[in-house]
């Protein structure tokens, strides 16, 4: 049951009036003022954007509405020398070439600044090779080509399927395996789902469409020239060759018809498994090289894109609270697109606007919540979370000391099967009670709550009559929030099914084709997907913000903590002869875990018995609540990650999108039996065991009773 | 503490065939590549063969291939390499080795091969 | 298949000299090089790998550097139970793994 404080208001100013006042209709107007541009990072149809969005949340009835700028390193093709890629035979003659741009989807023919494809922060380079076909370019594809099949990818150029993980983990590994160009594009067997048409008479993905991105390996560090610093006026920049993340050989994305033609060449081995084969009509062959009558010819990339710093521009809205104005709780999102943002940013973005009105009619009426709610329209995402990172490192010890939680905004829809929600397990029990106070906007679900139809289509695979929520990866703003500050997090949006539809995302992620009427007209012609999804944003913003003792359950954090404990426990038996030979114990960490649940059901025992009307006594308890996040930070950050802080979870190494828990001794497990030195490879695993279980024992303490 | 420990090292006539075997202890066997190295008397270091964790995949020097096999027994943590057609210039100190990324990391005390006319 | 050559064959220095030990490799191996210690009537024993890497137990006097297709193993300050055979072996393209042919290193 949902606990509201009416503050200096009439009752009926509630939750229920926040949500009543949410309307479709809006959130469809504002996606379609938001998307008929392109607004990508860095450009002046961005900051107009920006601008207006300020305007706007100034009338709606914030407090206030500031533009908070940065300088930051931005990537971009050149417009008089574009990128492509050649087959080119013995002579160097370019005997076929990638296309230079996507055909444009009907009634955009004519608009400008549309960014060509390219895989943002790329080096310069015109390398020549034979091609390897790693498939997704993951960890496990080129352990598979290196370690069974001896194919070496020393100096080729390797060609990648996008999906699976992180784009920029695929480089990352090309790069590994020393390869000096990857050519990454979107297979129909991932962007192209049965029985439904491509872009326009579909959600699908057009031969000719291509999905744009960076390729950065930030692991949270922000602006690439002032890793833990804002990229201020004042600011020291490094040298481009000390730039944290930049990818040191050639990238480019190319749609399935450019990918064909390369691929129907290929020679050398044969695909491994069917694992490795597509839906286009090709081998798969890995090569290396093109096969018989092609042998002599040669695959070239021609890339001219430039580094630019650039002046980016977030928005951030302030509405008050009545009661605890220095508690924080933020509902972030970005603005900028790679082209039209469609989906990505602009579903989001719409239904930010109108929780943002919603809450703004509120005060108008004289209403306040009890702590703060910052409102904050990101730039800069699509180039590797920046926005949201220079206001966090610029604003790190306000947020530190007062962030309660993050509400992250992104892409409101990723499909319309059901909900997906991520989120720290303190916010487990906050989500479960609203979507049980939500109507489900599914089909044969009319008059049930959310919470039934989530659970029934997504069911948790540990508890059943209970939906699955997954963990924070990264990849979003919430990034720097919760990885590095160490602030209770969560996001939530409709997704596809998971189960029937295996494609990698959505078809038309970051192409062209991500526009007004792909939303309008196939995902959410209603909006009423979209307006389940406000309803969820808002009203745990709302909860977070307005009710008397934080709606966090340290309970839920016991609960998953055993369960990661047994989980790398298991992971580290598989050497179970090592581990005797070099003493390696969990003990410690297992009885770090048992403190906690024990010491958190006595917390939790006290937070339903203590004085409430004590504000010293509500103070101490909501900030024992609070602080249990940061309580998982360690400042010395993780290894070679030093802005991934959080001990419990950390995007996976091996895919940013990901989430591992305790990835400490994760990384320091994997692969360990390939570590040229086991006894210092297993020192380290009993160095990370150390760090867990000193680390889970005194966020323990934090909920000890004060004295 | 990781031991590997080679046995069936002995004189043997050219034509002639032999099995070395080696016990592993200390390490998860079955989580590692083996191989065998030799080496002739005075004389540098020669691989001879690997094999897969899983014993799926094998590995030969040219000058071995086709008659020498190895082979193992995850259960018993055990490496085998079984020789036939045995050659005067096969006459070494034969290494059982644990090699991890293609370094050798661990070695047996080795067991001498003499093959003789 | 990658070849690789050790020089000198053989060397002489007195304890608390230093030396250095070079070998080449007949394309570029990056860093995949290793060197290993050899004693008379025992097995080889790991010191360096990918080049600069200091097995766990290997005291500090010895380090290894080079990248592509020259490397070295420096022994700075010899100590009695130094005077070995030293081996390199290239780790990048494999089958088969390869080894150089051996540099002894005698008392004076």
């Known amino acids: 049951k949902s606990s509201n404080e009416a503050t200096n208001i009439t009752p009926k100013h509630n939750m229920k009036a926040f949500l009543d006042e949410l309307k479709a209709e809006n959130i469809k107007k504002f996606l379609y003022n938001f998307t008929q541009i392109p607004h990508l990072a860095g450009t002046e149809q961005n900051f107009q954007l920006a601008k207006q969005i300020q305007s706007q949340w100034k009338e709606f009835g914030l407090d206030s509405v500031e533009l908070a700028h940065y300088d930051v390193l931005l990537s971009y093709p050149n417009k008089t020398h574009p990128n492509y890629i050649s087959i080119i035979n013995e002579d160097g003659n370019e005997i076929f070439n990638t296309s230079l741009f996507e055909p444009p989807p009907p009634g955009y023919e004519n608009v400008s600044d549309i960014v060509p494809p390219f895989s943002a922060f790329s080096p310069q380079g015109m390398p020549e090779g034979d091609l390897v076909y790693v498939n997704y370019a993951r960890t496990e594809d080129f352990f598979k080509l290196e370690r069974d099949m001896k194919i070496n990818c020393s100096g080729k150029i390797v060609i990648a399927r996008y999906g699976k993980v992180f784009r920029g983990n695929k480089v990352k590994n090309a790069q590994l395996a020393g390869a000096k160009g990857v050519i990454l594009y979107s297979d129909p067997a991932d962007y192209f789902a049965p029985g439904v048409k491509s872009y326009p008479d579909g959600w699908n993905l057009p031969g000719g469409g291509v999905q744009r991105g960076n390729i950065l390996n930030l692991n949270g560090a922000g602006d690439p020239l002032t890793p833990g610093y804002p990229a201020n006026e004042y600011a020291y920049r490094r040298g481009i060759a000390e730039a944290v993340g930049l990818p040191s050989i050639p990238v480019h994305p190319i749609g399935y018809y450019d990918a064909q033609k390369l691929l129907e060449k290929m020679g050398g081995s044969a695909p491994p498994d069917s694992s490795w084969r597509g839906s286009l009509k090709v081998p798969y062959n890995v090569g290396p090289g093109f096969t018989g009558n092609f042998s002599t010819q040669k695959v070239k990339m021609h890339i001219h894109s430039t580094n630019e710093v650039t002046r980016i521009y977030n928005v951030i809205g302030t509405l008050r609270g009545a009661v605890e104005p220095d508690r924080y709780v933020i509902l972030g999102g970005h603005r900028d697109s790679w082209v039209f943002g469609g989906i990505d940013p602009q579903s989001g973005a719409a239904v930010v606007h109108e929780i943002v009105r919603s809450f703004g009619t509120l005060k108008k009426e004289g209403w306040r919540p009890r702590r703060t709610i910052l409102f904050a329209s990101w730039d800069a995402e699509e180039f590797g979370l920046l926005g949201s990172t220079e206001w966090a490192e610029e604003n790190s010890r306000l947020l530190q000391e007062r962030g309660v939680a993050y509400i992250n905004a992104d892409s409101s829809i990723e499909g319309n099967y059901t909900l997906r929600v991520d989120c720290t397990p303190l916010m487990y029990s906050l989500v479960h009670n609203l979507t049980k106070e939500l109507k489900s906007p599914d089909e044969g679900f009319e008059g049930k709550s959310l919470y039934e139809s989530w659970t029934k289509k997504s069911p948790s695979p540990e508890f059943s009559g209970m939906p699955r929520i997954s963990k924070l990866g990264s990849g979003n703003d919430f990034e720097v929030f919760f990885q590095r500050l160490g602030i209770a997090s969560g996001r939530a949006r409709y997704t596809k099914n998971w189960e029937t539809n295996k494609f990698s995302g959505y078809p038309l992620y970051h192409s062209v084709y991500e526009t007004y009427e792909l939303v309008e007209k196939f995902y959410d012609p209603m909006f009423k997907y979209h307006l389940t999804v406000a309803q969820v944003r808002g009203g745990m913003v709302f909860e977070l913000a307005n009710s008397i003792v934080l709606p966090f359950d340290c309970r839920d954090y016991a609960v998953v903590l055993r369960k990661y404990a047994d989980k790398i426990y298991s992971i580290s038996m598989k050497h179970p002869q090592e581990m005797k030979t070099y003493s390696v114990s969990f003990d410690s960490l297992f009885s770090a875990v048992k403190n906690f649940t024990e010491i958190a059901s006595k917390f939790s025992e006290r937070l339903q018995d203590f004085d409430k009307s004590n504000p010293i006594v509500l103070r101490m308890m909501n900030d024992q609540l609070m602080f249990l996040e940061r309580a998982f930070i360690d400042p010395l950050g993780l290894p070679d990650r030093p802005f991934y802080r959080h001990v419990i979870y950390a995007p996976s190494s091996h895919n940013k999108y990901a989430g591992e828990s305790f990835p400490g001794i994760y990384d320091a497990l994997f692969d360990i039996e390939s570590k040229v030195d086991p006894s210092k490879a297993w020192g380290e695993v009993k160095r990370q065991i150390y760090v867990a279980a000193f680390t889970v024992q005194a966020a323990a303490e934090t909920l000890s009773e004060v004295a | 503490e990781v031991q590997l420990v080679e046995s069936g090292g002995a004189l043997v006539q050219t034509g002639g065939s032999l099995r070395l075997s080696c016990v592993a202890s200390g390490f998860t066997f079955s989580n590692y590549w083996m191989s065998w190295v030799r080496q002739s008397p005075g004389k540098g270091l020669q691989w001879v063969a690997s094999i897969k964790k899983d014993g799926s995949d094998e590995d030969y020097v040219d000058s071995v291939k086709g008659r020498f096999t190895i082979s193992r027994d995850n259960a018993e943590n055990s490496l085998y390499l079984q020789m036939t057609s045995l050659r005067i210039e096969d006459t070494a100190v034969y290494y059982c080795?644990?090699?991890?990324?293609?370094?050798?990391?661990?070695w047996g005390q080795g067991a001498l091969v003499t093959v003789s006319s | 298949d990658i070849q690789m050559t050790q020089s000198p064959s053989s060397l002489s220095a007195s304890v608390g000299d230093s030396v250095t030990i070079t070998c080449r490799a007949s394309?570029?191996?990056?860093?995949?090089l290793n060197w290993y210690q050899q004693k008379p009537g025992k097995a080889p024993k790991l010191l360096i790998y990918?080049?600069?890497s200091l097995l766990s137990g290997v005291p500090s006097r010895f380090s290894g550097s080079g990248s592509g297709t020259d490397f070295t193993l420096t022994i700075s300050g010899l100590h009695p139970e130094d005077f070995a055979t030293y081996f390199c072996q290239q780790s990048f393209s494999t089958p088969p793994i390869t080894f150089g042919q051996g540099t002894r290193l005698d008392i004076k």
């Open positions: 394309q570029s191996i990056n860093n995949y």
């Open positions: 990918t080049a600069s």
């Open positions: 080795a644990r090699f991890i990324s293609a370094v050798g990391v661990d």
